[in-house]
Amino acid sequence: IPAPSIRLVPPYPSSQEDPIHIACMAPGNFPGANFTLYRGGQVVQLLQAPTDQRGVTFNLSGGSSKAPGGPFHCQYGVLGELNQSQLSDLSEPVNVSFPVPTW
């Protein structure tokens, strides 16, 4: 299954105390998927998209993360044939530093 797209949601954090918001989006033909956010290979959070939506926003509270952040990846899972769960490839990484540089 194709990897999801990932992005850091603005406003970007300026310190370790600020929350981090990360959006993850599956391809258009996978609405209602279950999403997992990883940090350094460890599961950080799980969210299910609404049945009519392709993605979710993970909200990580400030101070809960080791600095500097990342890399974050996300992944989604869907039920395939015979109700077996199928996992996507991992997204590209997103790194968070403080303050986050603007492009």
């Epitope: 797209s5 970007y12 300026s14 989006m25 993605g55 926003t57 590209e92």
Partner: antibody, heavy 117, light 107 residues
Framework: QVQLVQSGAEVKKPGASVKVSCKAS????????MHWVRQAPGQGLEWMGI????????NYAQKFQGRVTMTRDTSISTAYMELSRLRSEDTAVYYC??????????WGQGTLVTVSS | DIQMTQSPSSLSASVGDRVTITCRAS??????LNWYQQKPGKAPQLLIY???SLQSGVPSRFSGSGSGTDFTLTISSLQPEDFATYYC?????????FGQGTKVEIK
């Protein structure tokens, strides 16, 4: 339904400041960032910045750094954009727009700011 | 900043025509691309998000495709209410940037 209602048109003199408001309804105001985008007459869309209503964090476009201030009042579900040291080139329609995981989904009706001596 | 280049800047078409507008990003933006429609004196309205998903309430004659740097908005059969200006927008990173717009006019 989700709605963003902006304040009315303003006429300002060069050098003055303007403060535009954007009142949100139909959703949890503190759960979504608020963008500001402007559009000069006959021109395209230009992003100005974003504020997080939950904690007041902001990111501003470099072009407006030092001249723009975005604030919010969560008690009345309202975001504000103040632009100072106005010049004629700031004549534009200013829009607020809600941030969701897939971008900017709902926009205010726009506020025309005219800068003229 | 990521530059967004739309083409054409304007086009003339008739009701029933198939219309295609393209948008190119100066670097990869994955699928983080939206298309908006704007009519004179009105705010932009979201048509397509995530490059290919139809926003709720938008007619199915609108479709979007692409990923990475090249994207397309297609109107399969142009209707009178579709004459407007269309903008692409990237939102993978700030500053969020828009294409310069494509004005669809009546031939």
């Amino acid at each position: 339904q989700v709605q963003l209602v902006q304040s009315g048109a303003e006429v300002k003199k060069p050098g003055a400041s303007v403060k535009v408001s954007c009142k949100a309804s139909g959703y949890t105001f503190s759960g979504y960032g608020m963008h500001w985008v402007r559009q000069a007459p006959g021109q395209g869309l230009e992003w100005m910045g974003i504020i997080s209503p939950s904690n007041g964090n902001t990111n501003y476009a470099q072009k407006f750094q030092g001249r723009v201030t975005m604030t919010r009042d969560t008690s009345i579900s309202t975001a504000y954009m103040e632009l100072s040291r106005l010049r004629s080139e700031d004549t534009a329609v200013y829009y607020c727009a809600r941030e969701v995981y897939y971008g900017l989904d709902v926009w205010g009706q726009g506020t025309l700011v005219t800068v003229s001596s | 900043d990521i530059q967004m280049t739309q083409s054409p800047s304007s086009l003339s078409a008739s009701v029933g025509d198939r219309v295609t507008i393209t948008c190119r990003a100066s670097q990869s933006i994955s699928s983080w691309l939206n298309w908006y429609q704007q009519k004179p004196g009105k705010a932009p309205q979201l048509l397509i998000y995530g490059a290919s998903s139809l926003q709720s309430g938008v007619p199915s004659r609108f479709s979007g495709s692409g990923s990475g740097t090249d994207f397309t908005l297609t109107i399969s059969s142009l209707q009178p209410e579709d004459f407007a200006t269309y903008y692409c927008q990237q939102y993978i990173s700030i500053p969020i940037t828009f294409g310069q717009g494509t004005k669809v006019e009546i031939k």
